[in-house]
Interface confidence: low
């Protein structure tokens, strides 16, 4: 339905909390780089001007477009070309170029200082000073680190974080209470935003089909008793919903994703026996109770899929009348069948039955030609099935930290090209897929790690579009989403690659290691390690062992040492000296 | 260089009209909306009127009739009819902080002023 | 039209002490309410919009509070350079007058 002013419709919709949230979100990930005042002041100058057409539908510019009325906005920036450079050239195209041009210059990796948390009491006096204040910079510093973070579920995510300051800053141990929390609300949120940036990169690389052929197999896992008309029903809304925030529509997104939850919420006995406690909570923790909400029972009596999609001699005829449905039903049927396969996994599948039928369907016998078709997909099964399995074992062996390490030199030798900070950010969170899914029985393990795994390297992904410095990451990055973990996976030793010439002052360190936390710690020492490997790529993994317990030695002897200083500067040279020896530099 | 200056005959007799000018530079007439405010000698601050982005014009009740706004791609006008010894003052052109919808903000950029002084 | 009361027209106080200019409006404004310095012979400088953020470039010991009718300005610190006229102005979009100046404080050194 058409409305005469759509920023006064979406604030009627949407109330102006979360109407002034929202645009405060849109603003600050798209200018990453201006200070929170002047978002705030342009956040409130459009929500002035909504009210305006809340009040008036027919006053003057409250018929304008969102983009046009957000980009006109943002344009007005007085610093926008010294501070974002040819940024600044969108300006002077029009809808809808202009919003497309702001999208094509989010930056995944902008140049901001760490986030670094104050003392509790400080936090505490904050919140208390200016809530309102406090609450909008929570969701400005996080927008702009995340630019393509799902908006509505950072509203969920302010609004925990708004009742974790609640609750703890009148506790006793204000620290006990509050850190925990805070931790938890951090690590959910940096795994929420890569999550919904493949989302993204989905949709904006490889298409809506590709979007939808995903939807199709997760809710068909999720909803197994839901019919095929109400999986396609529900594909459509949520390929809306995350088009419109991938697009920066995110008024329209929030206003769909609430109206998907209402209907999911009024038609649950046709989708889910699951989503009872989900539909009884209010509206933020209702959507995102529903996209975590746990798998429902599998009907007890589906029969084989072979009779439809195989058997039938109407299958070359189902699928020429109508191509994508019928794909849509075979992933469907697939999917709903195997909550213990990976989506990927599943969107292979798809993706081999659709070029059998291609080619077959065009053979003069073509019933003879795709009678076999499902056995090719049992090697497609078994390849993630053994790599799982490998690697939980070499977890289990390893522990979390170590195998970290094992997967940094892994794929520091596969793609040495790619810059340091990367190769330690990407491993170590690919190493996380042990402590996350190894624990799983068999039947959750690949579902959990290789959709973990796909999100973690389209990370790899959209850093390395950023500054492409590896044929090979670009290659595995576009030629096939689905296909992205095992081209990564199938990678050997980089031959091509010329050793990094060694440079002492990246393995100098100082007292400051001694004052950092466990996991700063860590990622110092893993740094200097694909460092190594960038020196001496054909080392052995007993020779990076033997250096990396030297160097684990000499940080701890150093931060025992009383002149911890001079113990780095001298015994640093000593460690530098024996680790070229061990490794023959 | 973002600036704003302000020019015009400085003397002008009772009952005349005038018009002075508000050129600016470093930044475009249709991002910004740019009001006239004055100030008689030992006075406070008086608003005139503003002239958004799309030419719209908005007066203060006590100018509206008597005095114009005007604007070309560079050039903002301010035309004074009738004028009065007690319209003797400084006059400012500024502009607002950035555009808003309903081109009324914060007055962040002045110029220097022109004295327009009106007597016998 | 939005009136805007200032108080006090004038005031005087010594280095280091703190001072509060109050603002008026007659009717509510939101939060739409700028301050601006003005120096003998000098332009006016904006010091804080939207009724309490504070102009860039602009000290810190400026503080700007208040909504709807009641705005105040306060000077933490005084400085030799802060004596001056202070003036409140509102700009309201709903209003066919869009900005209304209060009558100015004059600010002097003790």
């Known amino acids: 339905d058409a409305h005469k002013s759509e920023v006064a419709h979406r604030f009627k919709d949407l109330g102006e909390e979360n109407f002034k949230a929202l645009v405060l979100i849109a603003f600050a990930q798209y200018l990453q780089q201006c200070p929170f005042e002047d978002h705030v002041k342009l956040v409130n100058e459009v929500t002035e001007f909504a009210k305006t057409c809340v009040a008036d539908e027919s006053a003057e510019n409250c018929d304008k477009s969102l983009h046009t009325l957000f980009g006109d906005k943002l344009c007005t920036v007085a610093t926008l070309r010294e501070t974002y450079g040819e940024m600044a050239d969108c300006c002077a195209k029009q809808e809808p170029e202009r919003n497309e041009c702001f999208l094509q210059h989010k930056d995944d990796n902008p140049n901001l200082p760490r986030l670094v948390r104050p003392e509790v009491d400080v936090m505490c006096t904050a919140f208390h000073d200016n809530e309102e204040t406090f609450l909008k910079k929570y969701l400005y510093e996080i927008a702009r680190r995340h630019p393509y973070f799902y908006a509505p579920e950072l509203l969920f995510f302010a609004k925990r974080y708004k009742a974790a300051f609640t609750e703890c800053c009148q506790a006793a141990d204000k620290a006990a209470c509050l850190l925990p929390k805070l931790d938890e609300l951090r690590d959910e949120g940096k795994a929420s935003s890569a999550k919904q940036r493949l989302k993204c990169a989905s949709l904006q690389k490889f298409g809506e089909r590709a979007f939808k052929a995903w939807a199709v197999a997760r809710l068909s896992q999720r909803f197994p008793k839901a019919e095929f008309a109400e999986v396609s029903k529900l594909v459509t809304d949520l390929t809306k919903v995350h088009t419109e925030c991938c697009h920066g529509d995110l008024l329209e997104c929030a206003d769909d994703r609430a109206d998907l939850a209402k209907y999911i919420c009024e038609n649950q006995d046709s989708i889910s026996s699951k989503l009872k406690e989900c539909c009884e909570k209010p509206l933020l923790e209702k959507s995102h109770c529903i996209a975590e909400v746990e798998n429902d029972e599998m009907p007890a009596d589906l029969p084989s899929l072979a009779a439809d999609f195989v058997e039938s001699k109407d299958v070359c005829k189902n699928y020429a009348e109508a191509k994508d449905v019928f794909l849509g039903m075979f992933l469907y049927e697939y999917a709903r069948r195997h909550p213990d396969y990976s989506v990927v996994l599943l969107l292979r599948l798809a993706k081999t039955y659709e070029t059998t039928l291609e080619k077959c369907c065009a053979a003069a016998d073509p019933h003879e030609c795709y009678a076999k078709v499902f056995d090719e997909f049992k090697p497609l099964v078994e390849e993630p099935q053994n790599l799982i399995k490998q690697n939980c074992e070499l977890f289990e062996q390893l522990g979390e930290y170590k195998f970290q390490n094992a997967l940094l030199v892994r794929y520091t030798k596969k793609v040495p090209q790619v810059s340091t900070p990367t190769l330690v950010e990407v491993s170590r969170n690919l190493g996380k897929v042990g402590s996350k899914c190894c624990k799983h029985p068999e039947a959750k393990r690949m579902p959990c790690a290789e959709d973990y795994l796909s999100v973690v390297l389209n990370q790899l992904c959209v850093l390395h579009e950023k500054t492409p410095v590896s044929d090979r990451v670009t290659k595995c990055c576009t030629e096939s989403l689905v296909n992205r973990r095992p081209c990564f996976s199938a990678l050997e030793v980089d031959e091509t690659y010329v050793p990094k010439e060694f440079n002492a002052e990246t393995f100098t360190f100082h007292a400051d290691i001694c004052t950092l936390s466990e996991k700063e710690r860590q990622i110092k020492k893993q740094t200097a390690l694909v460092e190594l490997v960038k020196h001496k790529p054909k080392a052995t993994k007993e020779q990076l062992k033997a250096v990396m317990d030297d160097f684990a030695a000499f940080v701890e002897k150093c931060c025992k040492a009383d002149d911890k200083e001079t113990c780095f500067a001298e015994e640093g040279k000593k460690l530098v000296a024996a680790s070229q020896a061990a490794l023959g530099l | 260089q973002v600036q704003l200056k302000e020019s015009g005959p400085g003397l002008v007799a009772p009952s005349q009209s005038l018009s002075i000018t508000c050129t600016v530079s470093?930044?475009?007439?249709?991002?910004?909306?740019m009001t006239w405010v004055r100030q008689p000698p030992g006075k406070g601050l008086e608003w005139i009127g503003t002239?958004?982005?799309?030419?719209n014009t908005n007066y203060a009740n006590w100018a509206k009739g008597r005095f114009s706004i005007s604007k070309d791609s560079t050039q903002v006008f301010l035309k004074m009819n009738s004028l009065q010894t007690d319209d003797t003052a400084m006059y400012y052109c500024?502009?607002?902080?950035?555009?808003?919808?309903?081109?009324?903000?914060?007055?962040?950029?002045w110029g220097q002023g022109t004295l327009v002084t009106v007597s016998s | 039209d939005i009136v805007m009361t200032q108080s006090p027209s004038s005031l005087s106080a010594s280095l280091g002490e703190r001072v509060t200019i109050t603002c008026q409006a007659s009717q509510s404004i939101g939060s739409r309410l700028a301050w601006y310095q003005q120096k003998p012979g000098k332009t006016p400088k904006l010091l804080i919009f939207y009724a309490s953020t504070v102009a860039s470039g602009v000290p810190s010991r400026f503080k700007g509070s208040g909504s709807g009718t009641e705005f105040s300005l306060t000077i933490s610190s005084l400085q030799p350079e802060d004596f001056a006229t202070y003036y409140c102005q509102s700009y309201d979009y709903s209003s066919s007058s869009s900005y209304a100046f209060g009558g100015g404080t004059k600010l002097e050194i003790k």
């Open positions: 470093g930044f475009s007439l249709s991002r910004y909306a």
């Open positions: 002239i958004t982005t799309g030419g």
């Open positions: 500024a502009r607002g902080g950035y555009v808003s919808y309903a081109d009324a903000t914060e007055l962040s950029l």
